[in-house]
Interface confidence: medium
């Protein structure tokens, strides 16, 4: 018969003949002949092959080097490679996780949106209006400003993205301020402390 030009799935062409590939976890020892099957051998300890193959050598399992901050997340088998991840407080520098770097802290004015994992760094977000963070932290979210009203107090100092509001006692004379006619171009008006803060921020 005519020698094949292509072989079926899980076969390979050699010497005008289709031979079976070795299954995952095994390496090729010798090709098949007209009279014998492909000869395969299991990979040794700490070795693997993860596909149907005709490799004569198995691959070494990845080494999770503790000096690089790595640890084993999933132990390798004869068919799978070892999966490394980073130790606590560290995350991978790349998708293949060949080394680790310490997590980043979020600076004041920023809060933690997502806490770092073994494979991703801390994700920080700016504190929106009404929230603040006064610390450099890899764990703390932005915190809401204190609500002075719920404590029967008034805002003495406005909050920022880095500082909380400062509350103070109610004081009729401080709470209401008379804006003179000159200041308002001939128009006299009574303004509350809250209006002043609103005016200051816009």
């Amino acid at each position: 018969p005519e020698p094949p030009t292509a072989c079926r799935e899980k076969q390979y062409l050699i010497n005008s003949q289709c031979c079976s590939l070795c299954q995952p976890g095994q390496k090729l020892v010798s090709d098949c002949t007209e009279f014998t099957e492909t000869e395969c051998l299991p990979c040794g300890e700490s070795e693997f092959l993860d596909t149907w193959n005709r490799e004569t050598r198995c691959h070494q399992h990845k080494y999770c080097d503790p000096n690089l901050g790595l640890r084993v997340q999933q132990k390798g088998t004869s068919e799978t490679d070892t999966i490394c991840t980073c130790e606590e407080g560290l995350h991978c520098t790349s998708e293949s996780c060949e080394s680790c770097v310490p997590h980043r802290s979020c600076l004041p004015g920023f809060g933690v949106k997502q806490i770092a994992t073994g494979v991703s760094d801390t994700i920080c977000e700016p504190c929106p209006v009404g929230f603040f963070s006064n610390v450099s932290s890899a764990f703390e979210k932005c915190r809401p400003w204190t609500s002075c009203e719920t404590k029967d107090l008034v805002v003495q100092q406005a909050g920022t993205n880095k500082t909380d509001v400062v509350c103070g006692p109610q004081d009729r004379q401080r709470e209401q301020k008379l804006i003179s006619e000159e200041d308002l171009g001939g128009e006299q008006k009574l303004i509350s402390e809250e209006d002043l803060h609103h005016h200051h921020h816009h």
């Epitope: 407080g89 560290l90 310490p102 997590h103 802290s105 600076l107 801390t122 450099s136 932290s137 890899a138």
Partner: antibody, heavy 122, light 108 residues
Framework: EVQLVESGGGLVQPGGSLRLSCAAS????????MNWVRQAPGKGLEWVSI????????YYADSVKGRFTISRDNSKNTLYLQMNSLRGEDTAVYYC???????????????WGQGTLVTVSS | DIQMTQSPSSLSASVGDRVTITCRAS??????LNWYQQKPGKAPKLLIY???SLQSGVPSRFSGSGSGTDFTLTISSLQPEDFATYYC??????????FGQGTRLEIK
């Protein structure tokens, strides 16, 4: 009140060993990374080593790598620095310093001990 | 490793003066810069963290600014207790954690 008290310093010959301790109080010791920082006489500050709070991951300055070992006993609220193969250039005041975070995140040192003097001389 | 360079290395000033100390990083460190004060025979004390945030209990005459590679520590009106040595420290690329060589502030 946070307190860090170092001990174990003294005079040691070149090639000798010494173990420094830092007793911590006033905070949840296991929740914070801890550092050793040293200062040679009349010189600036040099960071020596850090150990993270929970799993005790360690890092060292190149100048002490392989000779010094940082460790902690969270049950005793104590930080240690085992110093072997000491050299003249290791002569310094050694401070323990508390990190503001539990992991090695790039955070400042908010509390320091008073320091303990290590003199390496024959 | 990131190198930190402070200037000047020493400085003479009088009570009431406004004083500025600078710190330069060998590469960008964003705002991961801390300032410490150290008095003779004493441990360092954290003054400013994250380039511009004042540590709790530190007088408001101390302020910090800058980002990237150039940073400054300013004392708006020197007090007698401010005469000390000041160190900058980067905590961006850690470890190793690196300090500047220090700036000694003396009475004129």
């Amino acid at each position: 009140e946070v307190q860090l008290v170092e001990s174990g310093g003294g005079l040691v010959q070149p090639g000798g060993s010494l173990r420094l301790s830092c007793a911590a109080s006033g905070f949840t010791f296991s929740s914070y990374a801890m550092n050793w920082v040293r200062q040679a006489p009349g010189k600036g500050l040099e960071w020596v080593s850090i150990i993270s709070g929970t799993i005790g991951k360690t890092y060292y300055a190149d100048s002490v790598k392989g000779r010094f070992t940082i460790s902690r006993d969270n049950s005793k609220n104590t930080l240690y620095l085992q110093m072997n193969s000491l050299r003249g250039e290791d002569t310094a005041v050694y401070y323990c310093a508390k990190d503001t975070e539990r992991d090695i995140t790039g955070s400042p040192f908010d509390y320091w001990g008073q320091g303990t003097l290590v003199t390496v001389s024959s | 490793d990131i190198q930190m360079t402070q200037s000047p290395s020493s400085l003479s000033a009088s009570v009431g003066d406004r004083v500025t100390i600078t710190c330069r990083a060998s590469q960008s460190i964003s705002s991961y810069l801390n300032w410490y004060q150290q008095k003779p025979g004493k441990a360092p004390k954290l003054l400013i963290y994250a380039a511009s945030s004042l540590q709790s209990g530190v007088p408001s005459r101390f302020s910090g600014s800058g980002s990237g590679t150039d940073f400054t520590l300013t004392i708006s009106s020197l007090q007698p207790e401010d005469f000390a040595t000041y160190y900058c420290q980067q905590s961006y690329s850690t470890p190793p954690i690196t300090f500047g060589q220090g700036t000694r502030l003396e009475i004129k």
